[in-house]
Interface confidence: low
């Protein structure tokens, strides 16, 4: 099974070769290269020198080879970079090239969503309801769930809204939001609202959004 690697959008992924080099072979005897599952070459070290004529344009200038750890570093990661990679090492002998090592890696590219933000899109209407939107942007992969917590002095209610999502055509990052109409005809205490975004690995919480309810005014004195 391929080695699973996780790295972050716009950062660097380490694609290892995990070559023990028990024979203590010099790079000058070896041909080391990485390819993706489309057989496009990311990097080639040919007898100790980096060779660029075989590197595909989408990887050009984005890799660096660490000869100490036999690891290829893929920089400026894009979501499109996720998938399978192979490191292949050949020993160049007078009789020809002999493959002496190969290693498969499966790269996942992640992007952290921003802290969810609650924005009111209407004012409190006669203390009956308020329209809210909660949004979080620039994440990957798409989150599992987005919800809103309404907390009063006496209770906590969770609303699971319908999550709207959009994906950027270029970066493939997701923006997500939910809209909610919060009604509180019977609420007489102040209320705090939180927005929660759940991904496979994290749970992001918005800053609290507070609604201060005015105390009801006493009725005017009845004048006969």
């Amino acid at each position: 099974a391929p080695l699973k690697i996780q790295a972050y959008f716009n950062e660097t992924a380490d694609l290892p070769c995990q070559f023990a080099n028990s024979q203590n072979q010099s790079l000058s005897e070896l041909v080391v290269f990485w390819q993706d599952q489309e057989n496009l070459v990311l990097n080639e070290v040919y007898l100790g020198k980096e060779k660029f004529d075989s590197v595909h344009s989408k990887y050009m200038g984005r890799t660096s080879f660490d000869s100490d750890s036999w690891t290829l570093r893929l920089h400026n990661l894009q979501i499109k970079d996720k998938g399978l990679y192979q490191c292949i090492i050949h020993h160049k002998k007078p009789t020809g090239m002999i493959r002496i090592h190969q290693m498969n890696s499966e790269l996942s590219v992640l992007a952290n969503f921003s802290q969810p933000e609650i924005v009111p899109i209407s004012n409190i209407t006669e203390n009956v309801y308020i329209n809210l939107t909660c949004s979080s942007i620039h994440g990957y992969p798409e989150p599992k769930k987005m919800s809103v917590l309404l907390r009063t002095k006496n209770s906590t209610i969770e609303y699971d809204g319908v999550m709207q999502k959009s994906q950027d055509n270029v970066t493939e990052l997701y923006d997500v939001s939910i809209s909610l109409s919060v009604s509180f005809p019977d609420v007489t205490s102040n209320m705090t609202i939180f927005c929660i975004l759940e991904t496979d690995k994290t749970r992001l919480l918005s800053s609290p959004f507070s609604i201060e309810l005015e105390d009801p005014q006493p009725p005017p004195d009845h004048i006969p």
């Epitope: 390819q35 599952q37 057989n39 070459v41 499109k80 996720k82 998938g83 050949h90 002999i98 499966e106």
Partner: antibody, heavy 116, light 112 residues
Framework: QVQLVQSGAEVKKPGSSVKVSCKAS????????IQWVRQAPGQGLEWIGV????????NYNQKFKGKATMTVDKSTSTAYMELSSLRSEDTAVYYC?????????WGQGTLVTVSS | DIVLTQSPDSLAVSLGERATISCKSS????????????LAWYQQKPGQPPKLLIY???TRESGVPDRFSGSGSGTDFTLTISSLQAEDVAVYYC????????FGQGTKVEIK
């Protein structure tokens, strides 16, 4: 664990269409291609085509161009193959398979019978 | 299109004996850069989907018994079952992924 689960057997009239589904689980759906292969009764394996889910591109065996259409729904990790203008010679078991450099996991197969 | 031709079409071998299947390609399947031969072998039993045995001509898939081995390079490839067992009765297919995909016509292995 990796699984490809295909839709059930279909009986179709000549001239009609059929859409076979292949639901993937246990791996990242977009990281692999899906191949479609058919096997007529008592015959060998015949490659229909491949859809590279991540890059959204398809390649068809020349024989199946215009006959088969491969699509995917990434939101449900499901691949589909639609066969049009069915004839009796399209009666076969249709397989989907996960592939990168080779086909390592296969669906259980879907029998499509074309009969008037 | 690349054509794969298997021989023989069927093969009867005694239990414990060696079975050898040949697969010839109409063009080389050797990727000169990776030194990989883009050829795989599959086993198919009645009523079941094919099962991957060997890929890159000679690499055994994990969980496949070591009596199965693949060899060859370029255009000529061989699948060998060193000591045939009853559960090896099946049809065996070679397939190339050098240029899209094609299958050989299959070789049926039976017990003599």
């Amino acid at each position: 664990q990796v699984q490809l689960v295909q839709s059930g057997a279909e009986v179709k009239k000549p001239g009609s269409s059929v859409k076979v589904s292949c639901k993937a689980s246990g791996y990242t759906f977009t990281d692999y291609a899906i191949q479609w292969v058919r096997q007529a009764p008592g015959q060998g394996l015949e490659w229909i085509g491949v859809i590279n889910i991540y890059y959204d591109n398809t390649n068809y065996n020349q024989k199946f161009k215009g006959k088969a259409t491969m699509t995917v729904d990434k939101s449900t990790s499901t691949a589909y193959m639609e066969l049009s203008s069915l004839r009796s010679e399209d009666t076969a078991v249709y397989y989907c398979a996960r592939a990168a450099w080779y086909m390592d996991y296969w669906g259980q197969g879907t029998l499509v019978t074309v009969s008037s | 299109d690349i054509v794969l031709t298997q021989s023989p079409d069927s093969l009867a071998v005694s239990l414990g004996e060696r079975a050898t299947i040949s697969c010839k390609s109409s063009q080389s399947l050797l990727n000169s850069r990776t030194r990989e031969n883009y050829l795989a072998w599959y086993q198919q039993k009645p009523g079941q989907p094919p099962k991957l045995l060997i890929y890159w001509a000679s690499t055994r898939e994990s969980g496949v018994p070591d009596r199965f081995s693949g060899s060859g390079s370029g255009t000529d490839f061989t699948l060998t079952i060193s000591s045939l067992q009853a559960e090896d009765v099946a049809v065996y297919y070679c397939t190339q992924s050098y240029n899209l995909y094609t299958f050989g016509q299959g070789t049926k292995v039976e017990i003599k």
